[in-house]
């Protein structure tokens, strides 16, 4: 049975030309994490492997940096990245989990956090 | 088409080294993993490690640790495995294998789907 | 480190049977298991990987199933080229082979 809880940073929004942090978190379970996947909608953009460690997409390579811990740093961000982004946790022996943020960049510096929510 | 090639036979003496190299082609050898089977004569598989060809980042079976070393020369799509200190028990075909997966399929690398040819290396005094 | 224990060990078939083997793990591992074939002196080929997805090429007699602990590749009718032996993989960390069935001519 799946017990765990995927925590992220929710919905967000960010300003064009800067920087955001897409941060999942996996609770609640012993389960073990063999690869984190991160998509936005169905392009991937970097996979963290247990053994292997990160691997950024060659198409965002300029732009997406691994980290802090499972997380994604995007970077020179414009509007076209404004979207649906999915971390995907894959464990074993519970499967798999998905965490889901919805990012907003702004062309003004109105820019603000929202809150954290958690998906079952 | 898509094929791992292996170096030839040795022959090393206890105490020594070997390095097997595995020569890639026929697909983009930065997007996927090399990993490294053994197999001693007559016995089963045995898992001895990988080696992400993106990123150079290894992982070894922990009764291997200290004495092999994976690595890759991107340039010339060659992944090499050395094994160092060898014993007797160490004599065994060595395998290389490319994962099932690409790094960007997203799906979960694990499975191996293309295998050299197999290096028979002899350790004996 | 997750044991890997196949059984059995070796069986004798005709060809035309249906072949069934059994690979236990011994703590579950999802459906992290993959299923390698191997001729004498020829390197494993991969039929089944994810537990139950038949790798390209591989012919559709090939089968697998289970999830957890306990996993099956099954054969449906034994082809002369499918003597040979069959070992399964577990690909959570460290990954490690069961030790292999043996599948003889009767």
């Known amino acids: 049975m799946m017990t765990g809880t995927i925590e992220t940073t929710g919905n967000i929004s960010a300003e064009k030309g800067g920087s955001i942090i897409l941060q999942c978190h996996l609770s609640s379970t012993t389960a073990q994490v063999t690869q984190v996947n991160w998509e936005q909608q169905d392009q991937l953009l970097a996979i963290c492997n247990a053994d292997l460690g990160w691997h950024i997409s060659p198409s965002f390579k300029d732009r997406v940096a691994p980290g802090p811990g499972l997380g994604l740093t995007l970077q020179s961000l414009t509007v076209n990245d404004t979207g649906e982004y999915f971390c995907i946790y894959h464990t074993y022996p519970d499967g798999t989990y998905t965490g889901r943020i919805f990012l907003e960049v702004l062309e003004s510096s109105v820019a603000e956090h929202g809150a954290r929510f958690q998906i079952p | 088409q898509v094929q791992l090639v292996q170096s030839g036979a040795e022959v090393k003496k206890p105490g020594a080294s070997v390095k097997v190299s595995c020569k890639a082609s026929?697909?983009?050898?930065?997007?996927?993993?090399i990993a490294w089977v053994r197999q001693a004569p007559g016995q089963g598989l045995e898992w001895m490690g990988w080696?992400?060809?993106?990123?150079?980042?290894?992982n070894y079976a922990q009764k291997l640790q200290g004495r092999v070393t994976m690595t890759t020369d991107t340039s010339t799509s060659t992944a090499y495995m050395e094994l160092r200190s060898l014993r007797s028990d160490d004599t065994a075909v060595y395998y290389c294998?490319?994962?099932?997966?690409?790094?960007?399929?997203?799906?979960?690398?694990?499975?191996?789907?293309?295998w050299g040819q197999g290096t028979m290396v002899t350790v004996s005094s | 480190d997750i044991q890997m224990t196949q059984s059995p060990s070796s069986l004798s078939a005709s060809v035309g049977d249906r072949v069934t083997i059994t690979c236990r793990a011994s703590?579950?591992?999802?459906?992290?298991l993959n299923w390698y074939q191997q001729k004498p002196g020829k390197a494993p080929k991969l039929l089944i990987y994810?537990?139950?997805s038949l790798q390209s090429g591989v012919p559709s007699r090939f089968s697998g199933s289970g999830s957890g602990t306990d996993f099956t590749l099954t054969i449906s009718s034994l082809q002369p080229e499918d003597f040979a032996t069959y070992y399964c993989?577990?690909?959570?960390?460290?990954?490690?082979f069961g030790g292999g069935t043996k599948v003889e001519i009767k």
């Open positions: 026929g697909y983009t050898f930065t997007s996927y993993a």
């Open positions: 994810a537990a139950s």
């Open positions: 703590q579950s591992i999802s459906s992290y």
């Open positions: 993989q577990q690909s959570v960390p460290p990954r490690t």
């Open positions: 080696i992400s060809a993106y990123n150079g980042n290894t």
């Open positions: 294998a490319r994962s099932g997966s690409s790094f960007w399929s997203g799906d979960v690398l694990g499975a191996f789907d293309i």
